[in-house]
Interface confidence: low
């Protein structure tokens, strides 16, 4: 049997303050438990929710917690079910609201002698005390006419008369806490002889030289005297008229007439009324001059066939505010339809290339009307002029493929190559009608091509293959200038391309033939062993059926490669002395050297005094700085080799002796002393 | 469960008199303002009347003179005393209570009980 | 005499659709949120849904929504399920000073498209 350990209790709660309704369950099986709250089963929220068994409440609501909880618990293998105990929560709340009138309707109602009831919006529970009070002093029950129903809220003043009139606000209070009226009840009741307003006047706007009229009227008993003012506090009478208001004329019924209206006349006009007793009223208008501003201009507007478009008009500034309307062709468009305008929107639906044109936005108002042309242009889809051909272009030459379409607006051509986009550089270049030109055609721009053609409306696209009519050439050219080292096997290279396969021979250039030990095996000059005969002019040709020849001229140098008879050591001198890197080079050409320190070359022309290369390619150094310690460079060159050797300097603070060491004591390491 | 049961309905002549009453169990319907509403076959919801807390009645302007609301606290109860019935009264008559003693909002409806009223 | 609007009087849609149905008083109500809505189907008792014009009642679907103050009001459905079909009642409270305490608008029946 399912049992209740803890049960929920009736208890009381504070409005959203924290409060738990306790449910504890023993059963021999599991159990599940829920809530129910008059009789619904309550869902969680963040602010009531299941903790446990109990049912936990962040935040108590008076209206959303009244009623009465249930706990349930139900085993769901045997279907047994335990309900607990009713509990509910005894709400203590209060809750500020206005002061409002209950009796009479509406305050147009309440008259001099009639019942005025008022009500104090405040609310609670326990119900709350209540005091009411006038201008802010507090009224007690059965004074003056007036007397208060606590229970009720009401505060009622039978009958009302003009010394009740004031701003009305109550305050409550109870054992939750208190609170006061939110917003107060001002009640006015008339005093015969104060000014009333039966007319009041109402802000105009006009045009420039138009006339404007201003009415206002009271009424009191004896009757009330009216006058009027401007800005400047002038009085306005039919008799004195301030000197920029001379067109201004004052009716025996209180209007004020002014003709002939000017920007000086603009601003505030002040109606007043006097009681033989009470405050005068005061009304004011304001004269308004019409003005309109222009119009900012519209951007050209492309939109697609089938679809449905807007164009806002925004209207210019002015007053009073300009109305607008479209036009188009001269006729102003309707309120419905497929075109038509709605509100300050031009709507186009179902857009037909009809529809293409001038449409134009007028506004007007008191001071005139403007007026801003929008051209609306209908996209449609290209069309071929002429689609890109499979073509032939030749190597090294402009190639040109066509892609020529038609629409409205001119269309966009993009390229392709190999589904790549092509972006204009040195080589690829659209032109304005579509066509792509490759300034110099090279043998890999055999491809796929594919232009694309596009308007707002849609878009069209072709492709063609471009196979490129190869020149018959050396790949690569032959250097013109070759060396061989005498002594030595050597092979120089040739070879060619076409849109055959050309046959490659070597020839000597005076036409006599080449000797026994060189051969010419498919393009490449074979030497078995260099000799100084070897020297000379060659020819190189590559031929072919329909592209005929092509020559390569070599000069081939016999030259003993360059090797180093001395090469300079790692050298360390003392500051201020000189150091000495030697090198020496031989070969055939006779070499020369260059310097390098520093990763910079040593200039022999433009050498300070301190450092000199000599004849036999040697570097001296005088009085050697530490900034000239680092890694030298010797590189000995000539037409047909090239060869370097490098060793470090070191630049040392020359010891002083100390006086156990004798003046021939060695240095600590091995110096070049001078 | 909290709910609200109306009886009293049924077949009576033009110009009877008949008396429904509003019967609470679950809640204490002292604490709440009941209201009486009503519904013609096939038509919409139409306020009759109510009584406050503090037994205040106020009447819609159609059933002033006619129409008289009341309460028993010790029997929790809620009555709508009917008079000079005519034949446009025929309706399901609902009593409902409010959200709580200061609104008048309706939270919680009874299930209705049909007044006939036809010769 | 207050009168309570409620259009569309009938409304048909479909399971999914998004349901707008708008109340106006012809009086502000007593306090700018004093409004509920109700739905009721043919033979029951109408079921409280919104009520302070925003709130949704314990145990609602949070399809069910309320905006609106003063005289204005709105009720949506988000997004209409099969047991949403029936008729819908807003319901305001007034100062009592003309007699009219109550009012109900004169109902929104919502019917399967």
């Known amino acids: 049997a399912i049992v209740f350990i803890k049960q929920p209790s009736s208890q009381d709660a504070l409005q959203g303050r924290r409060a738990l309704l306790r449910c504890e369950v023993e059963a021999p099986g599991p159990v599940h438990v829920y809530w129910l709250l008059d009789g619904a089963p309550v869902q969680d929220t963040e602010r009531r929710f299941a903790q446990g068994s109990s049912l936990s409440f962040a935040a108590v609501d008076r209206l959303q917690d009244s009623g009465t909880f249930q706990c349930v618990a139900r085993d769901d293998v045997t279907g047994e079910e335990a309900r607990s105990a009713n509990a509910s929560f005894n709400i203590k709340w209060i809750e500020a609201g206005p002061v409002v009138l209950k009796h009479p309707a509406s305050e147009a109602e309440i008259q001099p002698q009639t019942q005025v009831t008022l009500r104090c919006h405040i609310d609670g529970h326990p119900r709350p005390t209540y005091q009411w009070f006038r201008d802010g002093t507090p009224l007690s029950d059965g004074q003056s006419n007036h007397t208060v129903s606590s229970k009720e809220r009401n505060l009622t003043l039978r009958p009302a008369g003009p010394e009740h009139s004031g701003l009305y606000s109550c305050c409550a209070h109870s054992a939750f806490g208190q609170a006061c009226s939110s917003q107060n009840f001002t009640l006015s009741i008339a005093d015969e002889s104060f000014a009333r307003v039966v007319l009041a006047p109402q802000d105009v706007v006009v045009a420039r030289y138009e006339e404007a009229m201003f009415h206002c009227q009271f009424s009191a008993q004896p009757p009330p005297s009216l006058q009027w003012l401007f800005e400047d506090e002038t009085p306005i009478t039919n008799r004195s008229r301030p000197p920029h208001l001379r067109r201004a004329t004052v009716f025996a019924n209180g209007s004020l007439l002014l003709t002939q209206v000017r920007p000086r006349n603009a601003g505030i006009y002040r109606c007043i009324g006097q009681g033989q007793r009470g405050p005068p009223i005061i009304l004011e208008a304001t004269l308004h001059l019409a003005e309109i501003e222009d119009m900012p201009l519209f951007e050209p507007r492309v939109f697609t066939a089938g679809s449905e478009e807007r164009v806002t008009c925004l209207p210019p500034k002015g007053l009073p505010e300009p109305s607008v309307w479209w036009e188009h062709a001269g006729v102003r468009l309707p309120t419905h339809g497929r075109v038509y305008q709605k509100g300050h929107e031009l709507v186009l639906a179902n857009i037909a290339e009809s529809d293409a044109g001038v449409y134009t936005c007028h506004a007007a108002n008191l001071a005139g009307q403007r007026r801003q042309d929008v051209n609306i242009t209908v996209a449609t889809v290209p069309s071929w002029l002429k689609k890109p051909q499979d073509s032939q272009l030749e190597e090294g030459k402009p190639g040109y493929l066509d892609c020529l379409t038609q629409a409205t607006p001119k269309p966009t051509v993009v390229w392709y190559r190999n589904q790549m986009l092509i972006s204009e550089d040195s080589r690829f270049e659209v032109f304005k009608n579509g066509t792509l030109r490759i300034n110099s055609v090279e043998v890999y721009d055999g491809t796929w091509y594919r232009c694309m053609s596009s308007t707002p409306a849609g878009s069209i696209e072709a492709q063609a293959r471009v196979q490129v009519l190869e020149k018959l050439k050396f790949t690569p050219p032959p250097q013109p200038q070759q060396c061989m080292e005498f002594d030595k096997e050597a092979t120089v290279p040739c070879s060619a391309t076409g849109r055959e396969k050309p046959t490659i021979k070597w020839e000597r250039a005076d036409g006599s033939s080449l000797p026994e030990w060189v051969t010419d095996n498919a393009g490449t000059l074979h030497f078995a062993r260099v000799t100084r005969d070897d020297a000379g002019n060659y020819t190189c040709i590559a031929s072919n059926g329909p592209q005929g020849q092509i020559r390569a001229h070599v000069q081939l140098t016999v030259a003993v490669f360059i090797t180093f008879k001395v090469e300079p050591e790692r050298t360390t001198v003392y500051q201020g002395h000189t150091a000495l890197l030697q090198c020496e080079a031989q070969g055939d050409p006779k070499p020369l050297i260059q310097w390098k320190g520093k990763d910079r070359i040593l200039d022999p022309t433009k050498l300070g005094p301190r450092m000199h290369i000599f004849q036999n390619g040697s570097l001296v150094i005088h009085d050697v700085a530490p900034e000239d310690s680092g890694r030298y460079t010797c590189i000995a060159g000539n037409s047909c080799n090239i060869k370097h050797t490098e060793a470090p300097l070191y630049v040392v603070d020359k010891p002083v002796p100390e006086e156990s060491e004798g003046p021939g004591s060695p240095p600590p390491y091995k110096m070049i002393q001078t | 469960e909290v709910q609200l049961v109306e009886s009293g309905g049924g077949l009576v002549q033009p110009g009877g008199s008949l008396r429904l009453s509003c019967t609470a169990s679950g809640i204490d319907l002292s604490n709440y303002a009941v209201i009486w509403v009503r519904q013609a076959p096939g038509k919409g919801l139409e306020w009759v009347g109510i009584i406050y807390t503090y037994d205040t009645t106020y009447y819609a302007n159609w059933a002033k003179g006619r129409f008289t609301i009341s309460r028993d606290t010790s029997k929790n109860t809620v009555y709508l005393q009917m008079n000079s019935l005519r034949a446009e009264d025929t309706a399901v008559y609902f009593c409902?209570?409010?959200?709580?003693?200061?609104?008048?909002?309706?939270?919680?409806w009874g299930q209705g009980t049909l007044v006939t009223v036809s010769s | 005499e207050i009168v309570m609007t409620q259009s569309p009087s009938t409304l048909s849609a479909s399971v999914g659709d998004r349901v707008i149905i708008t109340c106006q008083a012809s009086q502000s109500l007593y306090n700018n949120k004093d409004l509920a809505w109700y739905q009721q189907k043919p033979g029951k008792a109408p079921k409280l849904l919104i009520y302070e014009a925003s709130k949704l009642a314990s145990g609602v679907p949070s399809r069910f929504s309320g905006s609106g103050s003063g005289a204005e009001f709105t009720l949506t459905i988000s997004s209409l399920q099969p047991d949403d079909f029936a008729t819908y009642y807003c319901h305001g409270e007034f100062s009592c000073g003309s007699g009219d305490c109550l009012a109900f608008g004169q109902g929104t029946k919502l019917t399967v498209l």
């Open positions: 409902a209570r409010s959200f709580s003693d200061i609104s008048d909002l309706i939270k919680l």
